[in-house]
């Protein structure tokens, strides 16, 4: 039977080493056996390269293409083949379709004066364009109460968030995860990092009645204060942007 593409390839680049294209066929397909995605940089002397797709679902194929450290001018010609049949042809400019790498190594540490310090790693080396462009979203949720979650925008430099323990329920188990985006590249959000879980052992203020009340901000330097004020709590909205390339 005839092979057809139902949803044409949608591609994103991590802007450092890899571009990923995903598409949907009109019926279940063995992607690696039946299809090939050829890609070639539009640059004098560039060779044609072939990507062998893998199945993400029965009829969904995904191809991961190694690319050189991307620059704004790079444009790739993409051709999707089923044997000798050209199913789709298009172009892809990595700088226009960035999906950052996932932040790594998310950890939670008890910090001075009843605060939790959340830390993670910037997924880009300092020499990469995206290293200094990333802002982050941190999602903190109660493992036993789906209604109890908070979302923080970390828009300052530095992959850290200080969280007052008093904003979380005492004795509850919480999980945090983080994702990144690059505003100047109009990127999509990265995938979420793996979650990290901890027990919020903070003692509510009511239990301190009659006792001296400690100042939860004592001992924090001005940077710490700025971090707390800048980690604004925001409403929970997720936007998914799908880019199609013709």
């Amino acid at each position: 039977g005839s092979v057809k593409v139902l949803h044409e390839p949608s591609c994103f680049s991590d802007y450092i080493s890899t571009s990923v294209c995903q598409w949907k066929m009109d019926h279940p397909t063995n992607c690696s056996a039946e299809l090939r995605l050829s890609y070639q940089l539009d640059f004098m002397g560039s060779e044609n390269h072939t990507c062998v797709p893998e199945n993400r679902e029965d009829s969904v194929c995904v191809c991961s293409m190694p690319i050189d450290d991307a620059v704004e001018a790079d444009v790739y010609q993409l051709d999707l083949w089923a044997g000798q049949q050209l199913l789709w042809s298009g172009s892809f400019q990595p700088s226009k379709h960035v999906k950052p790498r996932t932040p790594g190594n998310l950890t939670v540490h008890p910090n001075i004066s009843h605060t939790w310090l959340l830390m993670w790693t910037n997924p880009y080396p300092t020499e990469n364009h995206l290293h200094s462009e990333l802002t982050y979203m941190v999602n903190v949720s109660n493992d036993n109460d789906p209604e109890d979650f908070k979302v923080y925008n970390v828009t300052y430099m530095g992959p850290t968030l200080r969280l007052a323990a008093s904003t979380l329920k005492s004795g509850a188990s919480y999980s945090a995860r983080v994702r990144a985006w690059a505003q100047t590249y109009n990127s999509t959000w990265s995938d979420w990092s793996p979650s990290t879980t901890w027990l919020n052992y903070y003692e509510p203020w009511e239990q301190h009645l009659g006792k001296p009340i400690p100042n939860p901000l004592l001992g924090l330097d001005s940077t710490g204060l700025n971090d707390i004020f800048e980690a604004q709590k925001i409403e929970w909205h997720e936007h998914h942007h799908h880019h199609h390339h013709h």
Partner: antibody
């Protein structure tokens, strides 16, 4: 030592054909694009053609398109230029040169970093 | 096609002086930051051309540091400091960004 040696230049009549060869040594031939450049007597340099490392991509100057064919045999470390329908204005010294590294996704560029000694093609009746 | 224009077409300098050759392209040769696809070549009398500078300012191995390239976009300069008798020849700029590759007309350098 990186070296290019051209051969095949000759006196040929207008409309005739000639095949130039360029034997390379001292570097990994298949990894690099190769270029032909010519120089008419007393004139400047003129680019003729380029071929990628695998031979999969070729480019030509308008003046030779459809008449000249660039090719390579990576097993023999040899570059070729097949010249057909030759004209008086094709008279020149033909140089081969090593061009960009094309085994990477974006070719790495070093200019035309090694040139051969040249071979003279004369088209005259 | 990208047109390459060199000035001057001939130049006469005394040994020890500095020679400057200009090359202008009809389109920008800047592909990305730091990557101007502009080369300089020297053809000595009776010899094949030899590479001097690539990507606008990078010297090829074995090229003396008396040779330096500068510029970006469409305007480039080759400077030869402390000129020697051995520097005599014709200097060409070339764009390597897109097909067809194109050369300047050449600048003949004569040592007084």
């Amino acid at each position: 030592e990186v070296q290019l040696v051209e051969s095949g230049g000759d006196l040929v009549k207008p409309g005739g054909s000639l095949r130039l060869s360029c034997v390379a040594s001292g570097f990994t031939f298949r990894d690099y694009a190769m270029t032909w450049v010519r120089q008419a007597p007393g004139k400047g340099l003129q680019w003729v053609s380029l071929i990628s490392g695998s031979g999969g991509k070729t480019y030509y100057a308008d003046a030779v398109k459809g008449r000249f064919t660039i090719s390579r045999d990576n097993a023999k470390n040899t570059l070729y230029l097949q010249m057909n329908s030759l004209r008086a204005e094709d008279t020149a010294v033909y140089y081969c040169a090593v061009d960009r590294l094309t085994k990477t996704i974006r070719p790495q560029y070093y200019g035309l970093w090694v040139w051969g000694q040249g071979t003279l093609v004369t088209v005259s009746s | 096609d990208i047109v390459m224009t060199q000035t001057p077409l001939s130049l006469s300098v005394s040994p020890g002086e500095t020679a400057s050759i200009s090359c202008r392209s009809s389109q920008s040769l800047l592909y990305s930051i730091g990557y101007n696809y502009l080369d300089w070549y020297l053809q000595k009398p009776g010899q094949s051309p030899q590479g001097l500078i690539y990507l606008g300012s990078k010297r090829l191995s074995g090229v003396p540091d008396r040779f330096s390239g500068s510029g970006s976009g469409t305007d480039f300069t080759l400077r030869i400091s402390r000129v020697e008798a051995n520097d005599t020849g014709v200097y060409y700029c070339m764009q390597g960004l897109q097909s067809p590759l194109t050369f300047g007309q050449g600048t003949k350098l004569e040592i007084k």
